[in-house]
């Protein structure tokens, strides 16, 4: 699996999407887990509804929510109020029994809030025609890691 990078802005929401073959993973619950080190386990953060038929219902664990479009084959994870400590490697998983198949490997990168400047001259204020919500769009800039890029750089 290649790793897909999703970038979000600190304090805002980040939406991660994981496409999959809906027939191949028919009837399977899904999960979002955080990779603990290169060879470490993937620690479950949140999983879809216990009843697969209700997978479309949003389930939440803290600031992380998950929902599954089982017909379209897209698992969506939303990280609210993104913080620097949310940065790291994650996996979208398809569950069967005690098995967990990786649907997508994800690297979440947290960018500094461009509005969070001490210099008031740099502060951007929404115009009259723009709502406050418009200023907090859900950022989801994604790319795949380039060949040769190391997902887990060796630590000294």
């Amino acid at each position: 699996h290649n790793t897909t990078v999703f970038q979000g802005v600190e304090g805002q929401s980040l939406q991660v999407s994981c496409p999959y073959d809906s027939m191949k993973h028919w009837g399977r619950r899904k999960a979002w887990c955080r990779q603990l080190g290169e060879k470490g386990p993937c620690q479950r953060v949140v999983s879809t509804h216990n009843l697969w038929l209700l997978s479309f219902l949003r389930r939440r664990n803290g600031s992380t929510a998950i929902t599954d479009d089982t017909l379209g084959g897209t698992l969506t994870i939303t990280l609210r109020n993104l913080q620097p400590h949310d940065a790291g490697f994650y996996q979208c998983q398809s569950l069967h029994g005690s098995e967990a198949d990786t649907l997508r490997k994800v690297l979440v990168e947290v960018l500094a809030d461009p509005l969070d400047h001490r210099d008031a001259g740099d502060l951007w204020v929404p115009g009259e025609s723009e709502s406050f919500e418009d200023a907090h769009v859900e950022h989801s800039i994604s790319r795949s890691l380039l060949e040769g890029e190391i997902p887990f750089p060796p630590t000294s």
Epitope: M23, H25, W26, G27, L53, L95
Partner: antibody, heavy 123, light 107 residues
Framework: EVQLVQSGAEVKKPGESLKISCKGS????????IAWVRQMPGKGLEWMGI????????RYSPSFQGQVTISADKSISTAYLQWSSLKASDTAVYFC????????????????WGQGTLVTVSS | DIQMTQSPSSVSASVGDRVTITCRAS??????LAWYQQKPGKAPKLLIY???SLQVGVPLRFSGSGSGTDFTLTISSLQPEDFATYYC?????????FGQGTKLEIK
């Protein structure tokens, strides 16, 4: 009607190669996992491995990893089991089976089976 | 690998008898278990899935129970066509191993 039709019996010599087939009909072959199961003479069932023809995702039992190759051609709804160098101990009946899919749950159970292919390896 | 152990390996019974076959998994598999019937020269036939659900078309005299590591297949009243070999199979993880089989013979 769902059917899995396997290729006919084979008699081979040790060291020869072989590829047997399992053709599906009456269902969307691409969307079902297909397993291979071995039954040696007078013995029980042994799960060898499984393939999803849609993307050729394949899983092997550690006992058979490196001993056989499982493949599929979704364009002709056919799964294959092959050996590059047969041994006398490969003499067995080989079954293909479709993994059942429930409307509400995932599954690892096999609801439709081929009739079996007898492979005899003898010098 | 999860190993499946069936007992007994063979059992003799008469038409009308109640017969129970057990299957034990080497580790917990929740209810991810199937039972198959196989007659000589034929392919196996799915009887029970999810430990206790009866496959469509299977007679009601067949029933399954259990969860975790211990499972049973019960035939409430043996019929002549039930004499065959029975296998359990775990579906919790790969490889999806079968038990070694239980041969049900006429007494």
């Amino acid at each position: 009607e769902v059917q899995l039709v396997q290729s006919g019996a084979e008699v081979k010599k040790p060291g020869e190669s072989l590829k047997i087939s399992c053709k599906g009909s009456g269902h969307s072959f691409t969307n079902y996992w297909i397993a291979w199961v071995r039954q040696m003479p007078g013995k029980g069932l042994e799960w060898m491995g499984i393939i999803y023809p849609g993307d050729s995702d394949t899983r092997y039992s550690p006992s058979f990893q490196g001993q056989v190759t499982i493949s599929a051609d979704k364009s002709i709804s056919t799964a294959y089991l092959q050996w590059s160098s047969l041994k006398a101990s490969d003499t067995a009946v080989y079954f293909c089976a479709r993994q059942r899919t429930f409307y509400y749950d995932s599954s690892g159970y096999f609801d439709y089976w081929g009739q079996g292919t007898l492979v005899t390896v003898s010098s | 690998d999860i190993q499946m152990t069936q007992s007994p390996s063979s059992v003799s019974a008469s038409v009308g008898d109640r017969v129970t076959i057990t299957c034990r998994a080497s580790q917990g598999i929740s209810n991810w278990l199937a039972w198959y019937q196989q007659k000589p020269g034929k392919a196996p036939k799915l009887l029970i899935y999810a430990a206790s659900s009866l496959q469509v078309g299977v007679p009601l005299r067949f029933s399954g129970s259990g969860s975790g590591t211990d499972f049973t297949l019960t035939i409430s009243s043996l019929q002549p066509e039930d004499f065959a070999t029975y296998y359990c199979q775990q579906a919790d993880s790969f490889p999806r191993n079968f038990g070694q089989g239980t041969k049900l013979e006429i007494k």
